[in-house]
Interface confidence: low
């Protein structure tokens, strides 16, 4: 006769582990008992349970309520047992010893592998700012047994590096994703992908990149000179910029306070019916937490009664102040 068993039994944490031990013998052979033991390199061999032909299943009190026979129907030659709710401490080597009559004793050893699925966590790096060099965008850590695989899925150009810490019964893997921040990355997804034999499918955690930047400011509204004539209504100057975080806008007049009736509404400067008093240099101030930028334009309101006067559109000048 011989024992049919497995070299390795793999089970996910919390599941029931079936430890197989089936005696394949001649029809006239009988199994007297099947003894299950835990083989520990430090503690030696520790009885787990005993399947006795006469006494049935008896479990070592230390494993009470955790060891059972598989549900019926059962073959009298099947000495397999179920280890309920496998925990990491159950991982290791097990032995079944089958006492048969008249063939004698047979024994087999197997390894129980308890997979501990990882629960990944993603930690964003320091705030990203356009103009920085290679910077940590995010790190992703996953601990499990065996060691999980941690990779990144993204369209963003960057570099990834991993390091591993081994604990007595598990391993923690941390992967970092570094990049050179640019405004094109803003809003792009950066996904940490964790693979592990204990997972039915990869675990994914997505982080949306936020890169702080502030674009050059420019002013629109002076393109049509005919709008800037005395008496005209609805004239506006609009300050154009973009940034992350979204910028705030402010308007001032370089050569004095804003004329009466001129209204600031966010990025737009609204004029009342135009008079020559509205001529002057206007400055748009754009700022966010990262920096600030200025753009100035010269407005000259044309008086149709005075043909010598023309609307003068001065090229905008730009200034940039980093916070």
């Amino acid at each position: 006769g011989e024992l049919e068993t497995s070299d390795v039994v793999t089970v996910v944490l919390g599941q029931d582990a079936k430890l197989p031990c089936f005696y394949r013998g001649d029809p006239d052979e009988q199994v007297g008992q099947v003894a299950w033991a835990r083989v520990d390199p430090n503690e030696g061999i520790r009885e787990l349970a005993l399947l006795h032909s006469k006494y049935g299943l008896h479990v070592n009190p230390a494993y009470e309520d955790r060891v059972e026979q598989p549900p019926p129907p059962r073959d009298p030659l099947d000495g397999s047992v179920l280890l309920r709710n496998a925990v990491q401490a159950d991982e290791g080597e097990y032995e079944c010893r089958v006492s048969t009559f008249p063939a004698g004793s047979f024994q087999a050893r197997m390894r129980l592998r308890v997979l501990v699925p990882p629960l990944p966590s993603l930690n964003p790096g320091p705030p990203l700012e356009e103009g920085q060099g290679l910077t940590l965008a995010a790190s992703c850590t996953a601990e499990g047994s065996p060691a999980p695989s941690v990779t990144w899925d993204t369209e963003v150009k960057g570099t990834q590096s991993s390091r591993s810490f081994t604990h007595p019964r598990s391993a923690a893997v941390t992967s970092e994703f570094h990049l050179v921040p640019s405004r094109s990355m803003n809003g792009q997804p950066l996904t940490c992908v964790v693979s592990h034999p204990g997972l039915l499918q990869d675990r994914r955690i997505t982080h949306t990149l936020q890169v702080a930047f502030l674009a050059e400011a420019s002013v629109r509204g002076l393109e049509d000179q005919n709008l800037w004539q005395v008496g005209r209504e609805g004239a506006t100057l609009k300050c154009l910029s973009e940034g992350q975080p979204p910028p705030k806008y402010n308007w001032t007049r370089l050569d004095g306070p804003l004329p009466s009736g001129v209204r600031v509404k966010g990025d737009t400067l609204g004029f009342p019916p135009l008079t020559t008093e509205h001529s002057g240099v206007y400055v748009c101030h754009v700022s966010n937490e990262l920096s600030s930028r200025d753009s100035q334009v010269t407005v000259e309101v044309l008086d149709p009664e005075d043909p010598g006067k023309q609307v003068d559109l001065v090229s905008a000048s730009h200034h940039h102040h980093h916070h």
């Epitope: 003894a35 061999i45 009885e47 005993l50 006795h52 006469k54 008896h58 004698g104």
Partner: antibody, heavy 119, light 107 residues
Framework: EVQLVESGGGLVQPGGSLRLSCAAS????????MSWIRQAPGKGLEWVSG????????GYADSVKGRFTISRDNSKNTLYLQMNSLRAEDTAVYYC????????????WGQGTLVTVSS | DIQMTQSPSSLSASVGDRVTITCQAS??????LNWYQQKPGKVPKLLIY???TLQSGVPSRFSGSGSGTDFTLTISSLQPEDFATYYC?????????FGGGTKVEIK
């Protein structure tokens, strides 16, 4: 048929030594947990010591710890009890018994061997 | 160590009587309790194991019950061959321990 036969008993002086043997037959000795149990004249049963199939797990009653040593030789199907520093209170019939494990009942017993400690 | 306390230590009964012997463990031993019968000059014989399971060949008038710390051996109708000493034994942990015994005598 399962048989357990003890031998080695006899009269010994206090402080003396004896070695008991238990020869097993009719079952796979090497798979079974073996125990020594004693019974003083007119008294109850007292478990003395036990040893697992591979000698990996050994236990003793407090009353004999440090004086008695249990061992087995699976190749000879024999269980032993080395008794040193014997005292008058060790006088008893010594039985060997087998069980599937220490947490199973003692289902087969030998006929016993009498140890008398007296000056 | 687990102490096993058996009571009574002796009792007198007549053939046909119902006899009950109790055994108390000093801590919870689940159902790891066995009962043995010993006749004078004879080897102990296993009657009941796992608190309530009858050993093969043992008459059905013997029964066992209990779990945890309190256990009972009952002989429903005492027969002449049942006059003997009865011992309980815990197999929950080593050292294995026996009760002091209950001697059942003829009234």
């Amino acid at each position: 048929e399962v048989q357990l036969v003890e031998s080695g008993g006899g009269l010994v002086q206090p402080g003396g030594s004896l070695r008991l043997s238990c020869a097993a037959s009719g079952f796979t000795f090497s798979d079974y947990y073996m125990s020594w149990i004693r019974q003083a004249p007119g008294k109850g049963l007292e478990w003395v010591s036990g040893i697992s199939w591979n000698s990996g797990s050994i236990g003793y009653a407090d009353s004999v710890k440090g004086r008695f040593t249990i061992s087995r030789d699976n190749s000879k199907n024999t269980l032993y009890l080395q008794m040193n520093s014997l005292r008058a209170e060790d006088t008893a019939v010594y039985y060997c018994a087998s069980s599937g494990s220490w947490y199973l009942p003692l289902d087969y017993w030998g006929q016993g061997t009498l140890v008398t400690v007296s000056s | 160590d687990i102490q096993m306390t058996q009571s009574p230590s002796s009792l007198s009964a007549s053939v046909g009587d119902r006899v009950t012997i109790t055994c108390q463990a000093s801590q919870d031993i689940s159902n790891y309790l066995n009962w043995y019968q010993q006749k004078p000059g004879k080897v102990p014989k296993l009657l009941i194991y796992a608190a309530s399971t009858l050993q093969s060949g043992v008459p059905s008038r013997f029964s066992g019950s209990g779990s945890g710390t309190d256990f009972t051996l009952t002989i429903s109708s005492l027969q002449p061959e049942d006059f003997a000493t009865y011992y309980c034994q815990q197999s929950y942990s080593t050292p294995l321990t026996f009760g002091g015994g209950t001697k059942v005598e003829i009234k």
